[in-house]
């Protein structure tokens, strides 16, 4: 069945980087974009950026530009989100979401990955 | 950036009653060429990822009960739950995809 499975929770020190993975199964990833959205405790959902899984083109929200890198490995059917220069405010649950070409909504989500930034 | 404003922040409704959530965008989400409003509604329960309910402002995702409906165009949108069920207690988010992506602040729906 169609699903996105994310890597496990991470605890990181301020200034470090974190790389979260999102493994797709049950569909051809090249037909989709993968988006990353985060949610800090008790806060609204915040869009970070996306990757076109066909050609690896990326677009990032201005807020994260320079700090976030989204990549993909088609042979492993996996997308990755790496966030660098972590600070305490980056403590959040990070989600991947699938977006089909020309549809503009997330019909399948990963289960979420909690990233805690603490010294 | 397009700013999405939801109201109210929270809503207490009796079981079987109607719940109405509003979402306002800082600019029109209607693409005149395609005739579509690029607005979606998601439901999120504690400890779970969001779940797609409505896309293109009024199209219900498959498997979503017909008590959920979306309406509106341009800058003003509404999610309606016609008869609230216990399992509908959650936070509801609107999201625009007209230009990049922005979510509203969320509306918490609880039982009165």
């Amino acid at each position: 069945q169609v699903q996105l499975v994310q890597s496990g929770a991470e605890v990181k020190k301020p200034g470090a980087s974190v790389k979260v993975s999102c493994k797709a199964s049950g569909f051809n990833i090249k037909d989709y974009y993968m988006h990353w959205v985060r949610q800090a405790p008790g806060q609204r959902l915040e869009w970070m950026g996306w990757i076109d899984l066909e050609n690896a083109n990326t677009i990032y929200d201005a807020k994260f530009q320079g700090r976030v890198t989204i990549t993909r490995d088609t042979s492993a059917s996996t997308a990755y989100m790496e966030l660098s220069s972590l600070r305490s405010e980056d403590t959040a649950v990070y989600y991947c979401g699938r977006d089909a070409y020309g549809r503009y909504f997330y019909d399948v989500w990963g289960q979420g990955t909690l990233v805690t930034v603490s010294s | 950036d397009i700013v999405m404003t939801q109201s109210p922040d929270s809503l207490a409704v009796s079981l079987g009653e109607r719940a109405t959530i509003n979402c306002k965008s800082s600019q029109s989400l209607l693409n005149a060429r395609t005739g579509k409003n690029y607005l979606a509604w998601y439901q999120q329960k504690p400890g779970q990822p969001p779940k797609l309910l409505i896309y293109w402002a009024s199209t219900r995702e498959s498997g979503v009960p017909d008590r959920f409906s979306g309406s509106g165009s341009g800058t003003d949108f509404t999610l309606t739950i016609s008869s609230l069920q216990a399992e509908d207690v959650a936070v509801y988010y609107c999201k625009q995809s007209y230009s990049l992506r922005t979510f509203g602040g969320g509306t918490k729906v609880e039982i009165k």
Epitope: Y33, W50, D52, E54, N57, I59, D99, Y101, G102, Y104 | L29, N31, R33, T34, K36, Y38, S97, Y98, S99, L100
Partner: antibody
Framework: QVQLVQSGAEVKKPGSSVKVSCKAS????????ISWVRQAPGQGLEWMGG????????NYAQKFQGRVTITADESTSTAYMELSSLRSEDTAVYYC????????????????????WGQGTLVTVSS | EIVLTQSPGTLSLSPGERATLSCRAS???????LAWYQQKPGQAPRLLIY???SRATGIPDRFSGSGSGTDFTLTISRLEPEDFAVYYC????????FGGGTKVEIK
């Protein structure tokens, strides 16, 4: 109402390059897509690539990758298509049209079908 | 790449008759992303139908589009003299492609 006016016919030698222009009037040029489509004599239509000026980057059909360059100048509301390493099979009418695939993943730029079209530019490749 | 196959290659009909043109895709195409164009000799193509069934501005209602998935149809309910032309279907997904065209000629 958007109107597209293309540059005039060109005769080129094999191995050279050609650059065709497409000037838009009406509408907001930066936010809509422009595609280039060609039609060889007596043949069908073939999409070459497209650009959304506000984003600046173009996308190309696999067949033309590396040989075609599509650009846009927002200040003059003009799109350009340059095709290099010309060969006789490139003899065709080249059209620009409003619309292109939405590689930018935002609904506001969903502009896929092609309407209107420029009048076409005949490019003849001959030694 | 999605291949669109149009049939028939040529359709010979009299004015007043109904024309039915077929377009078959090698894989499923979203209805939102299928269009039909008319092209007359020496002219640029002209958009007739988008989204499989929506008529473009100014297109007479004798032109209609239908279909979904891999099978799409353009119907001209009563041919007028000005309708004799070549018709192309197009899918505008990630990499747009056109069908080979159907020539509608006078019998």
């Amino acid at each position: 109402q958007v109107q597209l006016v293309q540059s005039g016919a060109e005769v080129k030698k094999p191995g050279s390059s050609v650059k065709v222009s497409c000037k838009a009037s009406g509408g907001t040029f930066s936010s809509y897509a422009i595609s280039w489509v060609r039609q060889a004599p007596g043949q069908g239509l073939e999409w070459m690539g497209g650009i959304i000026p506000i984003f600046g980057t173009a996308n190309y059909a696999q067949k033309f990758q590396g040989r075609v360059t599509i650009t846009a100048d927002e200040s003059t509301s003009t799109a350009y298509m340059e095709l290099s390493s010309l060969r006789s099979e490139d003899t065709a009418v080249y059209y620009c049209a409003r619309g292109a695939p939405n590689y930018y993943g935002s609904g506001g730029y969903d502009d896929g079908w092609f309407d209107p079209w420029g009048q076409g530019t005949l490019v003849t490749v001959s030694s | 790449e999605i291949v669109l196959t149009q049939s028939p290659g040529t359709l010979s009909l009299s004015p007043g008759e109904r024309a039915t043109l077929s377009c078959r895709a090698s894989q499923s195409v979203s209805s939102s992303y299928l269009a039909w164009y008319q092209q007359k000799p020496g002219q640029a193509p002209r958009l007739l139908i988008y989204g499989a069934s929506s008529r473009a501005t100014g297109i007479p209602d004798r032109f209609s589009g239908s279909g979904s998935g891999t099978d799409f149809t353009l119907t001209i309910s009563r041919l007028e003299p000005e309708d004799f032309a070549v018709y192309y279907c197009q899918q505008f997904g990630r990499f747009p492609t056109f069908g080979g065209g159907t020539k509608v000629e006078i019998k």
